[in-house]
Interface confidence: medium
């Protein structure tokens, strides 16, 4: 007959013959021939494949360097490669998550408008008339000013974006 | 001059406590975020846990989750880290760290740090 020039799904064309690929999670040892199968073996400890293949060395894990920042979030197996995120306070600083940056912190003035995630930073928003922030955090958001009246006290010292109201007794002259 | 002084190592038997302090002074203590962070024999710099400025948000590595405990007294100035049933591989030099704007890493500030290992 004549020899293929095409094979099915999952198989390779090699030596005018059709052998089966090796399954994800395993290797190629040696080719099919006539005679016999392909022969595959599974990856070892920390490798993978994540397809069929016709690969004779497996593929590394991703290393999740904690030096950068990074820790794992997923574990690979013989078919996954690991999967690697952010410590908490980090964000990745591409999609592929090699390396992570510290969260922005929100300036007095500012606060967080969205906790950071492990792949987006911190948003900051300006602490609008009546709310103020005098710290410098990456969690805190605008607090709201003093209500003096509340406790039956009069304001002697306005707010601002960065600092509460003071609060001061009335005056008792005034009418 | 920013300063951080850790205190409160030592060494410890496998399921016992110990509780580290850290002493701040040269910055506004009560208007930063903290952390602290451990150092491993032979290991790079592995983050244990954040308090925000105010102590409201709190955050922990999942290697101490449940065990470890981050606090602070803003009226005091102090930093804590209180950590319950220890093992041994919580076996580190611990760092105080006040946290910078952003980043890479190392962390801006820290201490001198305080040892501690756990064993039998």
């Known amino acids: 007959p004549e020899p293929p020039t095409a094979c099915r799904e999952k198989q390779y064309l090699i030596n005018s013959q059709c052998c089966s690929l090796c399954q994800p999670g395993q290797k190629l040892v040696s080719d099919c021939t006539e005679f016999t199968e392909t022969e595959c073996l599974p990856c070892g400890e920390s490798e993978f494949l994540d397809t069929w293949n016709r690969e004779t060395h497996c593929h590394q894990h991703k290393y999740c360097d904690p030096n950068l920042g990074l820790r794992v979030q997923q574990k690979g197996t013989s078919e996954t490669d690991t999967i690697c995120t952010c410590e908490e306070g980090w964000h990745c600083t591409s999609e592929a998550c090699e390396s992570c940056v510290l969260h922005r912190s929100c300036s007095p003035g500012f606060g967080v408008k969205q906790i950071a995630t492990g792949v987006s930073d911190t948003i900051c928003e300006p602490c609008p008339v009546g709310f103020f922030s005098n710290v410098s955090s990456a969690f805190e958001k605008c607090h709201p000013w003093t209500s003096c009246e509340t406790k039956d006290l009069v304001v002697q010292q306005a707010g601002t974006n960065k600092t509460d109201v003071v609060c001061g007794p009335q005056d008792r002259l005034r009418a | 001059e920013v300063q951080l002084l850790e205190s409160g190592g030592g060494l410890v038997q496998p399921g016992g406590s110990l509780r580290l302090s850290c002493a701040a002074s040269?910055?506004?203590?009560?208007?930063?975020?903290m952390k602290w962070v451990r150092q491993a024999p032979g290991k790079g710099l592995e983050w244990v846990s954040t308090?925000?400025?105010?102590?409201?948000?709190?955050y922990y590595a999942d290697s101490v989750k449940g065990r470890f405990t981050i606090s602070r007294d803003n009226s005091k100035n102090t930093l804590y880290l209180q950590m319950n049933s220890l093992r041994a591989e919580d076996t580190a030099v611990y760092y105080c760290?006040?946290?910078?704007?952003?980043?890479?890493?190392?962390?801006?500030?820290w201490g001198q740090g305080t040892l501690v290992t756990v064993s039998s």
């Open positions: 040269g910055f506004t203590f009560s208007s930063y975020d």
């Open positions: 760290a006040k946290r910078e704007h952003a980043g890479q890493p190392p962390f801006d500030y």
């Open positions: 308090i925000s400025a105010s102590g409201v948000f709190t």
